[in-house]
Amino acid sequence: QPNNSLMLQTSKENHALASSSLCMDEKQITQNYSKVLAEVNTSWPVKMATNAVLCCPPIALRNLIIITWEIILRGQPSCTKAYKKETNETKETNCTDERITWVSRPDQNSDLQIRTVAITHDGYYRCIMVTPDGNFHRGYHLQVLVTPEVTLFQNRNRTAVCKAVAGKPAAHISWIPEGDCATKQEYWSNGTVTVKSTCHWEVHNVSTVTCHVSHLTGNKSLYIELLPVPGAKKSAK
């Protein structure tokens, strides 16, 4: 007998390469100068496969002595990218990822860019600016977001399985209507999580069930009509 488990519904969000930045324009710099210097660390969620631009404190480059970007990624030695204004020289230590670069020449722009953010870019990024007035720094706890792939299928009598595969962080699954559900999480070595929710509906007037997946990258809903109970032929509603 044909089974709706063959009718797999899948969804994967497609994102054109977007760019995200917490940098400010010059007008904002003058307005927010003191505020920004106080906000030393920022948690920043960034979607995977987008471009990210990380900014130093808004210090005029003419007042600068040294700019250093310190990059601490999981399981890797600390990488530093430094620029010394006096000698106009740049130096890198333990930096192997070619996607993490200065936005342009550091004497013109102190910002750091990550081209096509990957899971491996999860970590802490800190810009340290040495000036005659002291050292200023700004840090980012970069959290790479991965959109889960969502599937919905049936595997037995009035039971449906909704999976949010390889999301980061873990997705949350809810159902319409609520069923008798069990949820499991599977953690992967790359930091992604697969969430699997299996639900059963005993109530026979439930025709179609909807799986709603909530995630920081966006929400997704899929629905499927439940198969009849084997042997059930006719009922009045």
Epitope: I176, V206, S207, T208, Y223, E225, K233
Partner: antibody, heavy 114, light 107 residues
């Protein structure tokens, strides 16, 4: 692309029966519920019932229980809806729909008149 | 049975208007639904499936959203060809039930 082709218009006398057909193509006929709804002239839509071609399982709305019979012919991917003991208030356009209500036939006008 | 209350039942509109209509399930029952457009003598045309998914070929001025157990269909800028009756269909529970429709009329 799912297509549902319905039979032509019918004129029936009160007390008679009518059988409307709906031939499906473009999807696995036996894997999706087929629903029937109707719309009386100038009125809203009402659900009559559904049938699962893979097993013959059926649900009828109580309002039509005893007067409606839904069947399928899986060899031709055709669903049928028969309504008996017709009365004037059964005059309506009858639609078949599948794929969780996202694919509809064009409708069959059934006129009950003495 | 789950009753679907649709409002308003009719609406006088002008070209370019932003038009909004709502469907709500009885007793605030959580459901899922589709939105359809119907013109006289024609079969209903699916606009929005599963509350918020715009169907292929449907202009982007149409959008659907869910607010708790209430559902909204919005036409951002009404065009002359949008004059029709719109209705919702809840497909979560048997019997499936329809909203009574919102008829758009030109002012």
């Amino acid at each position: 692309q799912v297509q549902l082709v319905q039979s032509g218009a019918e004129v029936k006398k009160p007390g008679a029966s009518v059988k409307v057909s709906c031939k499906a193509s473009g999807h696995t006929f036996t894997s999706y519920w087929m629903h029937w709804v109707r719309q009386a002239p100038g009125q809203g839509l009402e659900w009559i019932g559904n049938i699962y071609p893979g097993s013959g399982s059926i649900n009828y709305d109580e309002k039509f229980q005893g007067r409606v019979t839904m069947t399928v012919d899986t060899s031709t991917s055709t669903a049928y809806m028969e309504l008996s003991s017709l009365r004037s208030e059964d005059t309506a356009v009858y639609y078949c729909l599948t794929m969780t209500g996202t694919s509809w036939g064009r409708g069959t006008l059934v006129t009950v008149s003495s | 049975d789950v009753q679907m209350t649709q409002s308003p039942s009719s609406l006088s509109v002008s070209v370019g208007d932003r038009v909004t209509m709502t469907c709500q399930a009885s007793q605030g029952t959580p459901i899922n639904l589709h939105w359809f457009q119907q013109k006289p003598g024609k079969a209903p045309k699916l606009l929005i499936s599963g509350a918020s998914n715009l169907e292929d070929g449907v202009p982007s001025r149409f959008s659907g959203s869910r607010y708790g157990t209430a559902f909204t269909l919005t036409i951002s800028s009404l065009q002359p060809e949008d004059i029709a009756t719109y209705f919702c269909l809840q497909f979560t529970y048997i019997p499936w039930t329809f909203g009574q429709g919102t008829k758009l009329e030109i002012k």
